[in-house]
Amino acid sequence: GPVQSKSPRFASWDEMNVLAHGLLQLGQGLREHAERTRSQLSALERRLSACGSACQGTEGSTDLPLAPESRVDPEVLHSLQTQLKAQNSRIQQLFHKVAQQQRHLEKQHLRIQHLQSQFGLLDHKHLDHEVAKPARRKRLPEMAQPVDPAHNVSRLHRLPRDCQELFQVGERQSGLFEIQPQGSPPFLVNCKMTSDGGWTVIQRRHDGSVDFNRPWEAYKAGFGDPHGEFWLGLEKVHSITGDRNSRLAVQLRDWDGNAELLQFSVHLGGEDTAYSLQLTAPVAGQLGATTVPPSGLSVPFSTWDQDHDLRRDKNCAKSLSGGWWFGTCSHSNLNGQYFRSIPQQRQKLKKGIFWKTWRGRYYPLQATTMLIQPMAAEAAS
């Protein structure tokens, strides 16, 4: 899972340059070959033209090249010239294709140079998966924005279904990509590429710029800015996971720069189950089973206008803030109200972003990110 410190291996710029130059040389080689063949055919055609009607004899002989003293029947000569013209035109087409390929390769080379020149601007694009101990005050890196991701989508001849599929076709740079899960319109997602594959970011909070206290329809469809804070949308997440089990990674950060990374094996239901989240395996990390309701328990999603929580006496989303998989209202809520400073009143404080077993029930977190990665189809329950 994403709780490891080893980095994915990225191709070095040297390797990329070797590949790029190799492609350029291949293009040039093809071009030279086409030019050579074309000039040979042109020479041959000139010789035949010069020979003209003077060349007669050896009927039916099509051996090339022809000796000037050969005697060729005019009809055979005409037939040969027609064949040569056809061949020449095919070579011409090949030449144009090669030239086109050459231009394309030169563009690719320029693009690599452009990327290379901007490479220095990028920070590391993989999750730092080591769980941070509070004493180490380790900072969790922000989601890196793409400079110009080298999209590998063309290999699929369609849009990728999710970030994991993008990873499988060779994409190694994190950033914004268009995906199109089966039966869904295309949409833009933040992909985090790690040594474990591609993860789709489904939630991000870091500055309080987006209001998360929204109704059911908003949580279903999604809201916010993929470049900033957002909730991807339950329907979009479900279209990514389908009926498969998934890994859910949760990154938390407090106001001192301490970070925690948790991972769960989950199953997300469709709207008919109120997008119930079921834990299908124990929690990975150091926070123990108290982090969330017991494994196997299915918790529906709730908002202030659609109360599906497990409390009969209370609407968790209404008394707290935002939409969440509320069990008893007190375990966690990463879609709560964003506080830049700790409010004095406890009543207000309980509405914040919290994860009880990490920094406590009344500690409003500074930043959170949720990522999902569907498992292979056979893993589905």
Partner: antibody, heavy 120, light 107 residues
């Protein structure tokens, strides 16, 4: 501040292809959708289509058979080609940045527009 | 495609008056409705996104409301510089579509 600038011929002959380019400055072209929108004189706005920086496109079904869009991230620009034009394609053509938002995308920056007249 | 119907087509208003423009969608679009202002010989400018959120730098006299199929743009205390055509736009489903526009003239 993001700025968009359309360029291309102001006069196109019927049955020919209209070609426009939009140069983006002030921000990278990456991570956004880029749209073309047109407006015939005295009329409303019509969305032509959009392109993402990966080159993936979506066109308005009403124009789909005649539209081609492309993007050049190294030059921070994107282009529109509209084939087999008629007088009905005479309009002011705008390029616009379509800001992705999970609550529904919107056009936050527009070019100043370029008038294209189709006439022989 | 989703059809947006704006009303009225034209409004002549005196300064300081309140202006209300409505936009009706042919099917529910949640809050994926945005409003633009276009002054003569200028390109459109975003005023309101997601039915009710003001875009940065837009004067507070402009406000939006509604969800589903019925939306309203309100200009409280109209100023001379507000003379323009106002368009609604939906991005709930592709293709993007715009309302026919409402021209606001200062009396």
């Amino acid at each position: 501040q993001v700025q968009l600038q359309e360029s291309g011929p102001g006069l196109v002959k019927p049955s020919e292809t209209l070609s426009l380019t939009c140069i983006v400055s002030g921000d990278s072209i990456s991570g956004y959708y880029w749209s073309w929108i047109r407006q015939p004189a005295g009329k409303g706005l019509e969305w032509i289509g959009r392109i993402y920086t990966s080159g993936n496109t979506i066109y308005n079904p009403s124009l789909k058979s005649r539209v081609t869009m492309s993007v050049d991230t190294s030059k921070n620009q994107f282009s529109l080609k509209l084939s087999s034009v008629t007088a009905a394609d005479t309009a002011v053509y705008y390029c616009a940045r379509e800001r992705p938002d999970y609550g529904g995308n919107f056009f936050d920056y527009w070019g100043q527009g370029t008038l294209v007249t189709v006439s022989s | 495609e989703i059809v947006l119907t704006q009303s009225p087509d034209f409004q002549s208003v005196t300064p300081k008056e309140k202006v209300t423009i409505t936009c009706r969608a042919s099917q529910s679009i949640g809050s994926s409705l945005h409003w633009y202002q276009q002054k003569p010989d200028q390109s459109p400018k975003l005023l309101i996104k997601h039915a009710s959120q003001s875009f940065s730098g837009v004067p507070s006299r402009f406000s939006g409301s509604g969800s589903g199929t019925d939306f309203t743009l309100t200009i409280n205390s109209l100023e001379a510089e507000d003379a323009a055509t106002y368009y609604c736009h939906q991005s709930s489903s592709l293709p993007h579509t715009f309302g026919g526009g409402t021209k606001v003239e200062i009396k």
